[in-house]
């Protein structure tokens, strides 16, 4: 999947653009908004009818090295009595994000952008009753 | 930066941390090959905390289109299909990394940017504060 070129109708390439070798791009990994903090609603992962836990995945050859993944706690959803309702299902909500992968080939190093699917949380759904024979 | 284990046989000049600027291949590797997007494509309608998806487009960013979730109701949908206001629909937010063209309008020069997106909604029990 290639990053789309800027359409000429919208932009002209400015003279100030840095020279870049063919087939690659220059990437500054000093993150814009690095210090913005998420004001997460208070522990929604425990108060949800489809509660979830968080696990941290760590990979030193990935930037960022830490990626947090959610895992639904139950198969069913939690009803008003605090019991699991198995006629409903807790399903994962997922979102793609980008990471930079560092690859070692012998003593040389290359960098590759990767799309990673992150499970963000869970929601309670009614399954489609659609039996396939 | 983060520390990288180095091949002990390699010259010692290599920096252990990720450099501030890197050259990366234009092709983006997709690790999500084992997922079926059709399966979750209509959770927004079938959830007890349904949401609408709004298109956020920015040609200076990659991906240029990001879909933002907005919860449809304050309450959650009960077994009878009615909105139950004893429960709350709340957005699930996630910080994701995108590419920002920098300098602006340049085709092959980017900077990573962290943005906050609402991915979907979940139904929660409200925290009840009893005022004495």
């Amino acid at each position: 999947r290639k990053i789309p070129k800027v359409g000429h109708t919208f932009f002209q390439k400015p003279e100030s653009c840095p020279p870049v070798p063919g087939g690659s791009m220059k990437l500054d990994i000093g993150i814009i908004n690095e210090n913005q903090r998420v004001s997460m609603s208070r522990n929604i992962e425990s108060r949800s009818t489809s509660p979830w836990n968080y696990t941290v995945t760590w990979d030193p050859n990935r930037y960022p090295s830490e990626v947090v993944q959610a895992q639904c706690r139950n198969l069913g959803c939690i009803n008003a009595q605090g019991k699991e309702d198995i006629s409903m299902n807790s399903v994962p909500i997922q979102q793609e994000t980008l990471v930079v992968r560092r690859k070692h080939q012998g003593c040389s190093v290359s960098f590759q952008l990767e799309k990673v699917l992150v499970t963000v949380g869970c929601t309670c759904v009614t399954p489609v009753i659609h039996h396939v024979q | 930066g983060i520390t990288i284990p180095r091949n002990p046989g390699c010259p010692n000049s290599e920096d252990k941390n990720f450099p501030r600027t890197v050259m990366v291949n234009l092709n983006i590797h997709n690790r999500n090959t084992n997922t079926n997007p059709k399966r979750s494509s209509d959770y927004y309608n079938r959830s007890t905390s349904p949401w609408n998806l709004h298109r956020n487009e920015d040609p200076e960013r990659y991906p240029s289109v990001i879909w933002e979730a907005k919860c449809r109701h304050l309450g959650c949908i009960n077994a009878d299909g009615n909105v139950d206001y004893h429960m709350n629909s709340v957005p699930i937010q996630q910080e994701i990394l995108v590419l920002r063209r920098e300098p602006p309008h340049c085709p092959n020069s980017f900077r990573l940017e962290k943005i906050l997106v609402s991915v979907g909604c979940t139904c929660v029990t409200p925290i009840v504060h009893h005022v004495a």
Epitope: R73, E84, P92, T119, P127 | R39
Partner: antibody
Framework: EVQLQQSGPELVKPGASVKISCKTS????????MHWVKQSHGKRLEWIGG????????SYNQNFKGKATLTVDKSSSTASMELRSLTSEDSAVFYC????????????????WGQGTSVTVSS | QIVLTQSPAIMSASPGEKVTMSCSAS?????MHWFQQKSGTSPKRWIY???KLASGVPARFSGSGSGTSYSLTITDMEAEDAATYYC?????????FGAGTKLELI
Amino acid sequence: EVQLQQSGPELVKPGASVKISCKTSGYTFNEYTMHWVKQSHGKRLEWIGGINPNSGGVSYNQNFKGKATLTVDKSSSTASMELRSLTSEDSAVFYCARGGDGYYTNYFDIDYWGQGTSVTVSS
Amino acid sequence: QIVLTQSPAIMSASPGEKVTMSCSASSSVNYMHWFQQKSGTSPKRWIYDTSKLASGVPARFSGSGSGTSYSLTITDMEAEDAATYYCQQWNSHPLTFGAGTKLELI
């Protein structure tokens, strides 16, 4: 063709633990739930619990909480169940059984079964 | 938990005979599901969502019922139908099975 291949029979001593496995083929392992069912003396079936590899969700019958632990290994498309602190009451045939995907069918909608693993607890 | 009571526990039928077995739930359920098990083999999905026949199940089988009362019927008993039939519900946690009805061939 959907297949659930369970590990072989086990003879274990009281107080010990046992782990039985269920290797799957013929479908996308991640997308479907795996349940475990106990059958004592060729009679009543008792649901132990289920696990969904994609969502990470698990659900246990209260009667088996602390007795059974369900896990999955996505890389080998294998589900496993560990039973601990075994007593003679735990002697039974244990089945893995595929449940729904939470999308087309409910997670608890069981369709395919493994051939069963016999566990005998005896000193 | 919902207790499923199957009756009769054991029954016999001749080839060609009509067979009906029942499953009573201690609380109302939306659907009932049935599994067939022959001696020494694993159970097979037989009827789901009260009345839908699983793939490969002969049309002589049918399921019906609602609320707390459900049944499985065979219009013309055949030798291969001799087995134990279990009803099952997943309307309420935990998922439960009945004790089974053993159907024997006369």
